[in-house]
Amino acid sequence: VGGYICEENSVPYQVSLNSGYHFCGGSLISEQWVVSAGHCYKSRIQVRLGEHNIEVLEGNEQFINAAKIIRHPKYNSRTLDNDILLIKLSSPAVINSRVSAISLPTAPPAAGTESLISGWGNTLSSGADYPDELQCLDAPVLSQAECEASYPGKITNNMFCVGFLEGGKDSCQGDAGGPVVSNGELQGIVSWGYGCAQKNRPGVYTKVYNYVDWIKDTIAANSHHHHHH
């Protein structure tokens, strides 16, 4: 909501999760792994990489089925704590200028830092208008104090807020699982909020920094390297 059409393939780590329709976003973090939101879990997912217009075949797409879908063991569907999911692709993505991985964070998100949020979610705060072309939004990371004041009792240490307390610009339904990137690092995953782009109700995002070890351990545990002697 309140964003702009991204320059074509300018967000090369952005993926669309498809189950016959686009239902969530995600981020490519290696040639065979995607990170998304825990609440985006489905038993069958097709990962669509290199997308810009999700309704048109433009020639840069790679459609790869999910081989493994691993939700965080402490995901809580009521509170959306630990709202993170890993998808192993059935075959590695072909990395190129339009499809490439985003780095995991080396430090937690800092208040005031500019970030890029992207997705194919609803662009209206009231009503529905789902875009075909990838939308981008530049937004600042808010302080934890501002975040907690916006959602008293709802914000855990695994969440942070990004956006504008005055409203008007925000992620929305269909953006879940997608990236929040600051300084070339995946800091957040689109998670939840009360409505979209409402005053004093900024978007809430999963704090990826808290899950770097889990991500690395999970990838290692699910990568089968065969050693020949």
Partner: antibody, heavy 125, light 107 residues
């Protein structure tokens, strides 16, 4: 395989209540929602309400507000629909149906991919 | 509430015919529409979801199209087992609403 199995037919008197059960199997119950739909004899489909199996959030059809309650028991993967103050025009086949969970900022889509076999409820004095 | 208007209410056709059923929403629902088939005494069965996606196991002679307010279900070559009642359903928002149904009968 994925299936929803409903409780048996009921005959009730006007003013009474009925509680229909819907037991799910073949999938993780809390990853989906359940809708309830009814069909009066010779009529079309009427949506009654929806319940999230993971959060127990509900949304009821306006005309049934105050008379209907939908619940779930995650320990037995069972959904329930209770309808009170029954009238003769509540005579219908009642269906439960599985739909996508709608949580957070995922795309909200309220289709129904798996249906129970139906429970006939007859209200007659 | 979003009203769903289906037409025709009934259609007589022969095996092998192409049958088209339309559904109109009273306001825009993007692609959030489903189509169901129901046979007498049976529960509805999902055919098409998100306006044009074919449900697993459903024959490819069924197809759906449309976006916004106008949607179509097409059966390219009617088979004996396709004689049934078809319903559209808006899957965009609460309250969920169905079309009135289209009965496909043998000519």
């Amino acid at each position: 395989q994925v299936q929803l199995v409903q409780s048996g037919a009921e005959v009730k008197k006007p003013g009474a209540s009925v509680k229909v059960s819907c037991k799910a199997s073949g999938y993780t119950f809390t990853d989906y929602a359940i809708s309830w739909v009814r069909q009066a004899p010779g009529q079309g489909l009427e949506w009654m309400g929806w319940i999230s199996a993971s959060t127990a959030d509900t949304n009821y059809a306006q005309k049934l507000q105050g008379r209907v309650t939908m619940t779930t028991d995650t320990s037995t993967s069972t959904a329930y629909m209770e309808l009170r103050s029954l009238r003769s025009d509540d005579t219908a086949v009642y269906y439960c149906a599985r739909g996508d969970e709608v949580v957070g900022k995922m795309t909200y889509y309220y289709g129904m991919d798996v249906w129970g076999q139906g429970t006939t409820v007859t209200v007659s004095s | 509430d979003i009203q769903m208007t289906q037409s025709p209410s009934s259609v007589s056709a022969s095996v092998g015919d192409r049958v088209t059923i339309t559904c109109r929403a009273s306001q825009g629902i993007s692609r959030w529409l489903a189509w169901y088939q129901q046979k007498p005494g049976k529960a509805p069965k999902l055919l098409i979801y998100a306006a044009s996606s074919l449900q697993s196991g459903v024959p490819s002679r069924f197809s759906g199209s449309g976006s916004g307010t106008d949607f179509t279900l097409t059966i390219s070559s009617l088979q004996p087992e396709d004689f049934a009642t078809y319903y559209c359903q808006q899957a965009n928002s609460f309250p969920i609403t169905f079309g009135g149904g289209t009965k496909v009968e043998i000519k």
